[in-house]
């Protein structure tokens, strides 16, 4: 029949070339000559001449060794004709099958493999892949097949078996205890990839394990114990620098510590901060120590880290002894601000009050007192013991000085340390109210028509407080009454003024006396322009003049 | 001489609540993961649970995890195993086992818990 | 996980040789040259008598030796004596769990 099987040829043959493959024969050769071809790729279309046929025997030849790598298998089509070219049989299919030799060794995808894994894990944990490859069957031979192992492991601490391999896939997993980064930090492995499932040719790559930190140390404070000097009063002020070590890896939250003050801070004066670069412990003061109240005070501060800890870690402590220096200290006004109420108008030489200063400092310093503002120059105060005294008149109504009936006054203390300090104080005077405003009237001009004149009202205002002020009394004083009269409202806050008879355009004095409730007598002169008109006018009219 | 001893185990009610502990001996402790294996009456060995040298990483059997807890003192060379929510399934002879190359090294005689009502 | 396979029992005569398979995946008896067999008398804890598939740990007879082929692993016992009747399991380190995987074990039946 004109059919051939499958033909099966091993890459890489040695020849002799060409080499006789198979014999295409037709059974129409019984009755005429017959011319053999073959077509294709591999015949005569790339890559050409790989195969030939002889035209008359019908023998496929093989002219060249084969790659199963670069092709596996060739599709070819036979032909016979007749000698006059006709063609005596359909065309065949002829398969030649490239069969496998291992001629080629397993590759590692790359030279060196990065991997990682956290310190202290388990047997069992993976930690990276490593692949490689081979060009050569890995379906119907084992030529292709790679099997993993590990060849070596540097260094060989705490053993030299701390990691094991996939032999088919190529996982690296750990398979010992006692991965500690903190004494083996990286483990760089030999791998090796062997074709024939690890009956043939082998390479090898290197794996690089890089063992990641665990907070599997705790920080521990060197030195443990500690003595600072801090001088009464300091705010902010840094006390003492705690040091700690930690094995884990720096910088890294498993390292970077974490203080806490346990005891021994019982009025809440101390805080302790990380140092960002060298991770000691910043003490310093959050409030001012007392070296009057406690010289001395003992800390307890405890040391963690950032991140917690990956186990039960026993945490160092650290004692800080804390020596309060004395200082001297100003003086303090008792109260810092001081009110005090006294009448305005007190003769010169009248005492206003006492006002002293304590000295926090345990010795008997002497204290010296003074005033160092006094706006008006109303006051006086005794250096040794700090009696104020009025020497000038306390004006409750001096606008200048005095805000919402307080006149405020600073004194300073001073003691005899070396170097002496002072302490202020303020002094807030309430000026009481005395009766020594009269009332006064507003405006004190007033223009007026002579025809049907219109009422003139005056705001009436007193300086003084109440109740020296309304009600008010109005009276004409200097026969002011005989043109005029004078009215005091219902609310007694205004006085009205008419003028009862007539007089020519002129300019008048209208003398009014006002009193207030507490008799409080004040005498105005109001000016007053009358003008040749009728009823309301704000200025007098000129001279009418007719055409 | 490398010594594991077991104890703690007992009679217990489902959803109760047993603490075992294994003292270790002979060995150092700390070097080594450690297991608790067990064994049900008449049946073959099951894994429960690991912790490594250090107590960092632990590790679970599907049928006992949220229930048991693994824990270790290195301090006092002590291996412990919380168990609550029993159940009668937990039944076994419990061994506690120090991890060589690959295999449970050495063994403890095991400690017996019983869940029943 | 599944659990190695292993015949449930295996007998043999006093001075004979017996082998007990333990049969398990590429992803564990195939993959690792980490397979160990523990002895267990009856009431007792089990004890190493192989590791890494054929490594005695000290102590142990030479009669027990160990070998394996692809997915399978082998403890031979030659020489049999009534000792070595007891209950043998066989455990692989394996992938994407930690620790070992048990097989279900061999009653050894020494006739």
């Known amino acids: 029949d004109w059919v051939v099987a499958p033909i099966s040829v091993p890459e890489n043959g040695k020849g002799p070339f060409p080499q006789r493959l198979n014999q295409l024969k037709s059974n129409k050769d019984r009755d005429t000559k017959i011319f053999y071809s073959i077509t294709g790729p591999g015949a005569d279309s790339p890559p050409e001449g790989v195969f030939a046929v002889e035209k008359e025997t019908g023998w496929l030849l093989l002219n060249k060794p084969l790659d199963r790598e670069e092709i596996a298998k060739y599709e070819l089509f036979g032909h016979a004709v007749s000698e006059n070219g006709a063609s005596v049989e359909d065309p065949m299919n002829i398969s030649i099958i490239v069969t496998d030799q291992n001629d080629h060794k397993p590759k590692f995808t790359q030279d060196t493999f990065r991997g990682s894994v956290l310190e202290g894990v388990l047997p069992g944990t993976s930690v990276m892949q490593v692949t490689a490859t081979d060009e050569d069957d890995a379906i119907y031979t084992y030529n292709g097949v790679v099997a993993y192992s590990i060849h070596s492991q540097e260094p060989k601490d705490p053993h030299d078996l701390m990691f094991t391999i996939h032999r088919s896939t190529g996982t690296i997993s750990v398979i010992s205890s006692g991965l500690d980064r903190e004494k083996v930090p990286e483990y760089t492995l030999t791998i090796q990839a062997t074709d024939m499932d690890g009956d043939g040719s082998t390479t090898t790559a290197v794996a690089v394990v890089e063992i990641l930190d665990a907070n599997d140390n705790a920080p521990m404070f060197d030195p443990q114990k500690y003595e600072a000097h801090v001088p009464e009063n300091a705010v902010g002020h840094e006390v003492q620098r705690l040091t700690v070590t930690d094995l884990d890896a720096p910088n890294s939250p498993a390292w970077r510590a974490t203080y806490l003050i346990m005891g021994g801070d019982d009025g809440d004066h101390f805080t302790i901060t990380t140092h960002p670069e060298s991770n000691q412990g910043i003490l310093t003061t959050r409030k001012g120590l007392d070296f009057e109240a406690k010289n001395q005070h003992t800390l307890y501060v405890e040391v963690t880290n950032e991140a917690p800890f990956v186990l039960k870690l026993p945490t160092s402590t650290a004692t800080i002894v804390v020596h309060v220096e004395d200082v001297n200290e100003a003086p303090v006004f008792v109260p810092p601000s001081k009110v005090v109420e006294v009448q305005e108008g007190i003769p010169t030489g009248e005492p206003v009050c006492v006002y002293t200063a304590e000295d926090p400092d345990k010795e008997n310093q002497k204290i010296s007192y003074r005033i160092l503002r006094d706006p008006a120059g109303w006051l006086a105060m005794d250096p040794d013991s700090g009696q104020v005294t009025a020497v000038g008149t306390l004006d409750r109504e001096d606008e200048q000085f005095v805000r919402n009936n307080i006149y405020e006054v600073m004194v300073l203390a001073m003691d005899n340390g070396s170097p002496p300090t002072t302490g202020t104080g303020t002094l807030l005077l309430t000026l009481i109210d005395v009766n020594d405003h009269g009332p006064v009237p507003e405006p004190r001009q007033i223009t007026i028509c002579n025809q049907s004149p219109v009422r003139q009202v005056l705001n009436i205002t007193d300086k003084d407080l109440s109740p020296h002020t309304s009600p008010f009394q109005a009276q004409l004083t200097d026969d002011s009454d005989i043109y005029w009269t004078a009215e005091v409202n219902e609310e007694g806050d205004t006085v009205v003024l008419s003028l009862k008879k007539f007089l020519k355009q002129d300019t008048y004095d209208v003398h009014l006396s006002l009193s207030d409730h507490g008799n409080k007598e004040q005498l105005t002169v109001i000016r007053a322009t009358v003008c040749d008109c009728h009823g309301h006018v704000e200025t007098c009219p000129g001279p009418w003049k007719g055409g | 001489e490398v010594q594991l001893l077991e104890s703690g185990g007992g009679l217990v009610q489902p959803g109760g609540s047993l603490r075992l502990s294994c003292a270790a001996s002979?060995?150092?402790?700390?070097?080594?993961?450690m297991s608790w294996v067990r064994q049900a009456p008449g049946k073959g060995l099951e894994w429960v649970s690991a912790?490594?040298?250090?107590?960092?990483?632990?590790y679970y059997a599907d049928s006992v995890k949220g229930r048991f807890t693994i824990s270790r003192d290195n301090s006092k060379n002590t291996l412990y195993l919380q168990m609550n929510s029993l159940r009668a399934e937990d039944t076994a002879v419990y061994y506690c086992a120090s991890w060589g190359l690959g295999s449970n090294e050495n063994w403890g005689q095991g400690t017996m818990v019983t869940v029943s009502s | 996980q599944s659990a190695l396979t292993q015949p449930a029992s295996v007998s043999g005569s006093p001075g004979q040789s017996i082998t007990i398979s333990c049969t398990g995946t590429s992803n564990d008896v195939g993959a690792y040259n980490y397979v160990s067999w523990y002895q267990q008398h009856p009431g007792k804890a089990p004890k190493l008598i192989l590791s890494?598939?054929?490594k005695r740990p000290s102590g142990v007879s030479n009669r027990f030796s160990g070998s394996k082929s692809g997915n399978t692993a082998s403890l031979s016992i030659s020489g049999l004596q009534a000792e070595d009747e007891a209950d043998y399991y066989c455990s692989s380190f394996t992938s994407g769990i930690v620790f070992n995987l048990f097989g279900g074990g061999t009653k050894l039946t020494v006739l």
């Open positions: 890494e598939v054929n």
């Open positions: 002979g060995f150092t402790f700390s070097s080594y993961a």
């Open positions: 912790i490594s040298g250090s107590g960092g990483s632990t």
